[in-house]
Each structure stands twice: as C-alpha cells, then as structure tokens.
C-alpha cells in the first residue's frame, strides 16, 4: 500500500495535507534536506487559506518556506508554478538585497513576523515548515 491515509505522529492535518512545524532553526538548504528525509518538502503555499493556517501555527517568527530563486527565477520546491500561483510578499519584496554584507543577494523566501513574505540570505538559521500531501504516500498499508 502506498497511499498515506493519515498524518504521521506530531504532524498537523489540514485540507488533505500534513504539516510539521520546527521549533529550532536551520539554513534553508538544511531545512529542505530535513523535509526530504521526512518524505516531504518545505511548505508550498497555494492559497490565502493555507497562508492563514500556516501563519496561525508559526506565530510571529521568521520561518522558511519552499520557495527560492537560487537558480534564477523564483521556484516552488514541488514544481507548483510561481508566476500564476498565490503570492504574499511584503511591499517592495522580493528585493534581492545585497547590503547585508554576507555576500551575494537574497535567494530564499520566508514568512516574516506578520506572515507576509520576504527574501533573505539562505544561510540564516530560521525555523521551517514541512508539508506532505495525503494519499500520496503512506506509512501503513491499507486494511484489506
């Protein structure tokens, strides 16, 4: 059986997806790897409703999402189309700011303290959210 019928322990179910909220920080790539090893991905926000759900759970804390432009254009980690999809950037963001003095610009997106999005240096150790879709994968075989 390969259908995920319910969320793993310590994950939160919402609208046919499972979400896991970290309580410590990692750089974006390390957070991405963590989610992959949970057979999940960094959260992909596809609607205002999902935005409010995630925002409610993370509170006013900088938190990575699965959106980056490290290879040029902005891309969601699961392949969801960025150009036609939901966006919730802060005013004048993303700005690929180089003034932070850490080298390079800002290539990874995160939720800010008010929930709106900002691009930031991918090495910053922010909290993160993993997401996996129900009925995509399963830990338990279905009952026959």
């Amino acid at each position: 059986g390969s259908e995920r019928t319910c969320c793993p322990v310590n994950w939160v179910e919402h609208e046919r997806s499972c979400y896991w909220f970290s309580r410590s920080g990692k750089a974006w790539a390390d957070a991405d790897n963590y989610c992959r090893l949970e057979d999940a991905h960094l959260v992909v926000v596809t609607s205002w409703e999902e935005q409010k759900f995630v925002q409610h759970h993370i509170g006013p804390v900088n938190t990575w999402m699965g959106l980056h432009d490290q290879n040029g254009p902005w891309k969601w980690v699961d392949g969801t189309d960025y150009e036609t999809g939901f966006k919730n950037w802060r005013p004048e963001q993303p700005d690929d700011w180089y003034g932070h003095g850490l080298g390079g610009g800002e290539d990874c997106a995160h939720f800010t303290d008010d929930g709106r999005w900002n691009d930031d240096v991918c090495q910053r150790p922010y909290r993160w959210v993993c997401e996996t879709e129900l009925d995509k994968a399963s830990q338990e075989p279905p009952l026959l």
Epitope: K26, D30, R36, L37, D39, A137, Q139, E140
Partner: antibody
Framework: EGQLLESGGGLVQPGGSLRLSCTAS????????MTWVRQAPGRGLEWVSV????????FYADSVKGRFTISRDNTKNTLYLQMNSLRAEDTAVYYC?????????WGQGTLVTVSS | DILMTQSPSSVSASVGDRVTITCRAS??????LAWYQQKPGKAPKLLIY???SLQSGVPSRFSGSGSGTDFTLTISSLQPEDFAIYYC?????????FGQGTKVEIK
C-alpha cells in the same frame, strides 16, 4: 524496544562489492529514516548515508558517493547498503541506526574487511 | 564539512568524580548536537540529543549544555559503568560529523 540486526559483512578484495543488510523489529520501520555509520578499527565514528522512511530521498558522505547505494524494503523491514569499488579505507564495522538526526537504536555492527 | 573537536581526548577520573567533556563546532550549529557513549566491542548509545535533552532511560547524572559552537557533556558523579568513550555529533548540516571521541578512564 526497537532492535536492529546487521548482516552481510566479510572479507572482500579491493575493487570488489558487498551488500549489507539491516533487519529491524520493535518499531514501525517505514515511519523512520535510517542511517549507516561506520567505524574503522581503533578509530572514531563516521556517518555514511541516510534514507527517508519511504525511500524517496537519500544522502551520502563524499567518501562513498558514487560507490555506495542505500536502499530499503519496507515490506521486509530491511535496510541495505550496496558497496561497490571497495577500497582498503572502507574497512570498518558498519552500523545501521534509526532516524535521521540522531540515532536512538543501533545494530551490533558487521565487520567489512577490504584486503588483498 | 563541520569539524567537531572534543577535549580532552582522554580523562582519568575516579568513581564519584564530576567529569566534563567539551565539544566545539567549526561553525554555529544552534542546538543540533547529540552525545553518545560507546563501550569496547559495542554499538554507541545515545545519551543526549538537541544539546540538552536527556534520552529516555539514560541516568540523570548525564547532562548536556551549550549552543552555537560550544557544548558540554557533564557526568555529575561518575559510576563504574560510565568508563567508556564519548562522542559528540552535529546534525545541523550534511554530512553529519562526529567528534574524535573522549576516553574516560579509571584513575
């Protein structure tokens, strides 16, 4: 209480291959990432590879990348490490361990000796 | 790769002593650190995870502290079964790396 039992170690010539197995019991195997760690004789611990619970993602140490392949069969509660192009420096006790960050269950280890 | 450096490499102590082992990371790892105990011929045993959380079943004489780059494992009152090698391990960035080990010997 979870248990892990490795097998498949032995003596192999440089350039040869070996497949290690790790059979799990006492926990829901498919729920957890699994890891291989090795320890050369008289030396410290070295992380080798990790695989996600459903096998969709895996990562490797640079020292084994392209030579070793981690896999799992959740229907058999078994983790594998396929080791190709073995070198003398791969000689070690190989442990399987549960989870992706830190490892609460370990097997007893299986010794791999690469020598001509 | 993140280099984990333990000190001392060995320590001689007596039963009842307080023993402190330090682990330094070559870059900040927040609290992504674990401590293990290994006895000869045996697999390592998880003692502490997330820098300071005591693994279930581990005696409370073991404690961990620190964040960022500097971490400490303390054994408050050394017992005969505590003579072993202790390793730290970072889980911040791949590849996970271990310290070189600290051997706690009988004085």
């Amino acid at each position: 209480e979870g248990q892990l039992l490795e097998s498949g170690g032995g003596l192999v010539q440089p350039g040869g291959s070996l497949r290690l197995s790790c059979t799990a019991s006492g926990f829901t195997f498919s729920t957890f990432a699994m890891t291989w760690v090795r320890q050369a004789p008289g030396r410290g611990l070295e992380w080798v590879s990790v695989i996600s619970g459903r096998g969709g993602s895996s990562f490797y140490a640079d020292s084994v990348k392209g030579r070793f392949t981690i896999s799992r069969d959740n229907t058999k509660n078994t983790l594998y490490l396929q080791m190709n192009s073995l070198r003398a420096e791969d000689t070690a006790v190989y442990y399987c361990a549960k989870d992706q960050l830190w490892f609460d269950y370990w097997g007893q280890g299986t010794l791999v000796t690469v020598s001509s | 790769d993140i280099l984990m450096t333990q000190s001392p490499s060995s320590v001689s102590a007596s039963v009842g002593d307080r023993v402190t082992i330090t682990c330094r990371a070559s870059q900040g790892i927040i609290n992504w650190l674990a401590w293990y105990q290994q006895k000869p011929g045996k697999a390592p045993k998880l003692l502490i995870y997330a820098a300071s959380s005591l693994q279930s079943g581990v005696p409370s004489r073991f404690s961990g502290s620190g964040s960022g780059t500097d971490f400490t494992l303390t054994i408050s009152s050394l017992q005969p079964e505590d003579f072993a090698i202790y390793y730290c391990q970072q889980a911040n960035s791949f590849p996970w790396t271990f310290g070189q080990g600290t051997k706690v010997e009988i004085k």
